[in-house]
Amino acid sequence: AVLIPQSSVCPNAEANNFLQNVKVNLKVINSLSSKASSRRPSDYLNRSTSPWTLSRNEDPDRYPSVIWEAQCRHQRCVNAEGKLDHHMNSVLIQQEILVLKREPEKCPFTFRVEKMLVGVGCTCVSSIVRHAS
């Protein structure tokens, strides 16, 4: 048995299969066919005119504890010659996701649902030109 300190408000760790249940459900939701998954590109981050890097965002008190997040490499976009185009901006595309956060200082198996904004990639947009009136 997991020797987790119990309190009156904590569910019993031995009887609680919460983590396993969540894992099973997420596997079903995330399951992609091999065909679809193999087509998913991993090199867009380098080939894009607004390239980005990925960092491994870790939070042990979050489920999932590992989320890969994008950050734009440049403020500007890269043109065909590989130079930065000062008329075009790189902007981060963000997606709102739901995560489970462990209740701090409480039970290891007690979580709350939270929204999280995650960067998934970058795109190129034209700079806003403000004309002097």
Partner: antibody, heavy 119, light 107 residues
Framework: EVQLVQSGAEVKKPGASVKVSCKAS????????FHWVRQAPGQGLEWIGV????????AYNQNFRDRATLTADKSTSTAYMELSSLRSEDTAVYYC????????????WGQGTLVTVSS | EIVMTQSPATLSVSPGERATLSCKAS??????VGWFQQKPGQSPRLLIY???NRYTGVPARFSGSGSGTDFTLTISSLQPEDFAVYFC?????????FGQGTKLEIK
């Protein structure tokens, strides 16, 4: 059946580079992280870094950040670990291991690749 | 980085007896600890994940317990094939770290 098959043993001179491969089969290569771990003779295990073949993201142990490069080739379902500026203390068995990101554990390991650095 | 300290370094036990291996983390790692078995010339083999969950195909004589900083791997009745080196590992935060190992030898 999930399998991780690594390249063969290497002998390198100090200052040289080595590139170890790890070919995955039996599952969708882009779905899980690949971690690299090394074990010096008679020693414990040391984490080098991680690559996610699905998105190309990498993260490194600070001790290896300047010398290790992790890459992945989706067309061949192969992950690579390159270590440069080799020194004698890099002599070790290098393992690739699959990490289940949601579940949070290493389940399958390659058979290991012995890299010997000697002048 | 989080340091994982295993004790004892070597444990001598007779077949059929119980073995208790200890692992301490330098800071709390919740239940994000795994235990691995390694035999000479072989890769590590996962036994326990999340401190107390037995991995698929692992015999019931292996059990894990603990949370926070103190963790234990127990082998209830040692079989000849159980004599090996055992490592604990934390994946609470990177860099992920391993204990130095406990060598379980036949008494």
């Amino acid at each position: 059946e999930v399998q991780l098959v690594q390249s063969g043993a290497e002998v390198k001179k100090p200052g040289a580079s080595v590139k170890v491969s790890c070919k995955a089969s039996g599952y969708t290569f882009t779905d899980y992280e690949f971690h690299w771990v090394r074990q010096a003779p008679g020693q414990g295990l040391e984490w080098i870094g991680v690559i996610h073949p699905g998105n190309g993201g990498t993260a490194y142990n600070q001790n290896f950040r300047d010398r290790a490069t992790l890459t992945a080739d989706k067309s061949t379902s192969t992950a690579y670990m390159e270590l440069s500026s080799l020194r004698s203390e890099d002599t070790a068995v290098y393992y690739c291991t699959r990490f289940l990101t949601y579940e949070g554990y290493f389940d399958y390991w390659g058979q290991g690749t012995l890299v010997t650095v000697s002048s | 980085e989080i340091v994982m300290t295993q004790s004892p370094a070597t444990l001598s036990v007779s077949p059929g007896e119980r073995a208790t291996l200890s692992c301490k983390a330098s800071q709390s790692v919740s239940i994000d600890v795994g235990w691995f078995q390694q035999k000479p010339g072989q890769s590590p083999r996962l036994l326990i994940y999340h401190a107390s969950n037995r991995y698929t195909g692992v015999p019931a004589r292996f059990s894990g317990s603990g949370s926070g900083t103190d963790f234990t791997l127990t082998i209830s009745s040692l079989q000849p094939e159980d004599f090996a080196v055992y490592f604990c590992q934390q994946d609470y935060s990177s860099p992920y770290t391993f204990g130095q190992g406990t060598k379980l030898e036949i008494k």
